[in-house]
């Protein structure tokens, strides 16, 4: 008899987009509407929750903009939290200082992306230093990953 | 008898590089010479044409530069067009304003990359706001994807 | 009799982080401690050495910062060297000019990432123009790849 058909495993993948009702850190994300993807990974209170240990490519982009440049330092972090560890682990980070001309309308993006070995129950989050300067358009601010 | 050797499917992948004879939008790309890759995906009039539905990581970098900064707003978009939909869908976008000192020679890059669920016959393109400010060196300006 | 269990091939992957004792080009990397990954790829004198021909996604981020901006041109390159070729091949590059306000403390990142067809024995390196302006925190400056 021929072997049973191979069970095609669902790809573990997420692509979440900016959600403008984020009021505090970590950033919250749109996980339902638009160009969102969420498969084999859970979304909980701003975080992507890993349910299978392995190698993942993790990425995020944040779009900062303002009307009267004051050059407040900007930071954009992807960090990991796991109940086994007391402290958050910053996986990737981008910082900007002195990036625009005083008083001018300005806009700038930060992009992060890299490979990490993640463990089941790891929670991944995105943090920014100046929430009021983030624009949450779905094409501009996003957070995602996929299992290699 | 031993089973027939497994047929190794060709990876669906593209990496196209800047083509300086781009005269209008969308940007056109070098699809033949240099560090170019094109396998299982077609290139047509500036666009990458998907021929198999699935999850893809899509990326692009554009290198902007000028001789005398006047801070024209810069935008860099990856968008999708499909005959089934009336309107282009902006998948990823980067914008820059107030990014250099007036009158100075300047240079800046925009990088975009994320995962999307693409459908057979989707056409992907790259658009920029200021074509005259783009440098098309193959290492500096590129557009690519691969099927997960 | 049932077939022998399938041998799960180790994923070819690397994620190296900034090493502050880099004194010259190419940059050197931390390959042992912290959030480092190195599997199926070798690290040798700043370079990632490919041992299996194929398609790879290669990425790097470099974090530049300074105490008093004088707008020195910054460049960040990922390049490839192979004994069969006389010259280095620049795969990806980012350049910045006129990016901060003279005399101010400043900070800026450059991110690169794309797909390449690499050959066994290819050596991949990262080069920057101003080593003294690079910050080597593991979350800020890194270099990695994975085989598709």
């Amino acid at each position: 008899p021929s072997p049973p058909p191979e069970k095609k495993e669902l790809r573990k993948v997420a692509h979440l987009t900016g959600k403008s009702n984020s009021r505090s850190m970590p950033l919250e994300w749109e996980d339902t509407y638009g160009i969102v993807l969420l498969s084999g990974v859970k979304y909980k209170k701003g975080g992507l929750v890993i349910n299978e240990t392995g190698l993942y490519f993790v990425y995020s982009k944040v779009y900062f903009r303002g009307q009267s440049c004051n050059n407040l330092p900007l930071s954009h972090k992807v960090y990991m939290r796991n109940s086994k560890y007391p402290q958050d682990l910053v996986m990737m980070e981008g910082k900007m200082m002195s990036y625009c001309t005083t008083g001018q309308m300005w806009a700038r993006s930060s992009y992060l992306g890299a490979v990490f070995n993640l463990t089941s129950a790891d929670h991944l989050y995105v943090n920014v230093s100046e929430l009021s300067l983030v624009n949450f358009e779905e094409s501009q601010t996003f957070f995602g990953l996929y299992k290699l | 008898p031993s089973p027939p050797p497994e047929k190794k499917e060709l990876r669906k992948v593209a990496h196209l590089t800047g083509k300086s004879n781009s005269r209008s939008m969308p940007l056109e790309w070098e699809d033949t010479y240099g560090i170019v890759l094109l396998s299982g995906v077609k290139y047509k009039k500036g666009g990458l044409v998907i021929n198999e539905t699935g999850l893809y990581f899509v990326y692009s970098k554009v290198y902007f530069r000028g001789q005398s900064c006047n801070n024209l707003p810069l935008s860099h978009k990856v968008y999708m067009r499909n005959s089934k939909y009336p309107q282009d869908l902006v998948m990823m976008e980067g914008k820059m304003m107030s990014y250099c000192t007036t009158g100075q020679m300047w240079a800046r890059s925009s990088y975009l990359g994320a995962v999307f669920n693409l459908t057979s016959a989707d056409h992907l393109y790259v658009n920029v706001s200021e074509l005259s400010l783009v440098n098309f060196e193959e290492s500096q300006t590129f557009f690519g994807l691969y099927k997960l | 009799p049932s077939p022998p269990p399938e041998k799960k091939e180790l994923r070819k992957v690397a994620h190296l982080t900034g090493k502050s004792n880099s004194r010259s080009m190419p940059l050197e990397w931390e390959d042992t401690y912290g959030i480092v990954l190195l599997s199926g790829v070798k690290y040798k004198k700043g370079g990632l050495v490919i041992n299996e021909t194929g398609l790879y996604f290669v990425y790097s981020k470099v974090y530049f910062r300074g105490q008093s901006c004088n707008n020195l041109p910054l460049s960040h390159k990922v390049y490839m060297r192979n004994s069969k070729y006389p010259q280095d091949l620049v795969m990806m590059e980012g350049k910045m000019m006129s990016y901060c306000t003279t005399g101010q403390m400043w900070a800026r990142s450059s991110y690169l990432g794309a797909v390449f067809n690499l050959t066994s024995a290819d050596h991949l390196y990262v080069n920057v123009s101003e080593l003294s302006l690079v910050n080597f925190e593991e979350s800020q400056t890194f270099f990695g790849l994975y085989k598709l």
């Epitope: 009307q67 004051n70 050059n71 407040l72 001018q104 309308m105 300067l133 | 707003p73 | 005399g103 101010q104």
Partner: antibody, heavy 119, light 111 residues
Framework: QVQLVQSGAEVKKPGASVKVSCKGS????????IHWVRQAPGQGLEWMGV????????SYNQKFKGRATMTVDKSTSTAYMELSSLRSEDTAVYYC????????????WGQGTLVTVSS | EIVMTQSPATLSVSPGERATLSCKAS??????????MNWYQQKPGQAPRLLIY???NLESGIPARFSGSGSGTEFTLTISSLQSEDFAVYYC?????????FGQGTKLEIK
């Protein structure tokens, strides 16, 4: 509550300099740029320039470049605007106003400082 | 620089009536879906007070009888039913780029 309190009225001779102060309170001073606007008697409003309260550098209206100098003292949450080589047409009320980077306009203004230039 | 032109220079209206003030910019003050046009009210001996930002948004604490409209180069401030405290000078101002510029003002007086 948010307040921008400016220094008192000044009378100056032509050719002299004047330095007007603007002290912010009731908010995080370094989160907002400070703009300076003047108004000659019976005339409209004229934008002079803006200073980054965080970084300390300024952008000026071309008309005042070389004569106006904007500075900030973060320790006292105070912005300053100095105008040199004064002439009679510089007689005006000088206002400071804060501008939130994430918003669209100058939302709070100082009460104004009258500078009179007369020989 | 962008030149702002207000009209009329003076507008005489009776209390309870509607007032419509106009402002034209020498070039578009729109960018990326927003109009960078603001309106201020100034009374004698006082600092200007922000009424409307981004062409049509009412500043916190400003009565709902004030409204703004327009885009591109043409903008309008409307006061639906004039109260005695509304008689003042009104300025439009763009914040699209530096230098910011103001209109010359419209004086709203009691008819």
């Amino acid at each position: 509550q948010v307040q921008l309190v400016q220094s008192g009225a000044e009378v100056k001779k032509p050719g002299a300099s004047v330095k007007v102060s603007c002290k912010g309170s009731g908010y995080t001073f370094t989160d907002y740029t400070i703009h300076w606007v003047r108004q000659a008697p019976g005339q409209g409003l004229e934008w002079m320039g803006v200073i980054s309260t965080y970084q300390g550098d300024a952008s000026y209206n071309q008309k005042f470049k070389g004569r106006a100098t904007m500075t900030v003292d973060k320790s006292t949450s105070t912005a300053y605007m100095e105008l040199s080589s004064l002439r009679s047409e510089d007689t005006a009320v000088y206002y400071c106003a804060r501008f939130p980077d994430w918003d669209y306009a100058m939302d709070y203004w100082g009460q104004g400082t009258l500078v009179t230039v007369s020989s | 620089e962008i030149v702002m032109t207000q009209s009329p220079a003076t507008l005489s209206v009776s209390p309870g009536e509607r007032a419509t003030l106009s402002c034209k910019a020498s070039q578009s003050v729109d960018y990326d879906g927003d109009s960078y046009m603001n309106w201020y009210q100034q009374k004698p001996g006082q600092a200007p007070r922000l009424l409307i930002y981004a062409a049509s948004n009412l500043e916190s604490g400003i009565p709902a009888r004030f409204s703004g409209s327009g885009s591109g180069t043409e903008f309008t401030l409307t006061i639906s039913s004039l109260q005695s405290e509304d008689f003042a000078v009104y300025y439009c101002q763009h914040s699209r780029e530096l230098p910011y510029t103001f209109g010359q003002g419209t004086k709203l007086e009691i008819k």
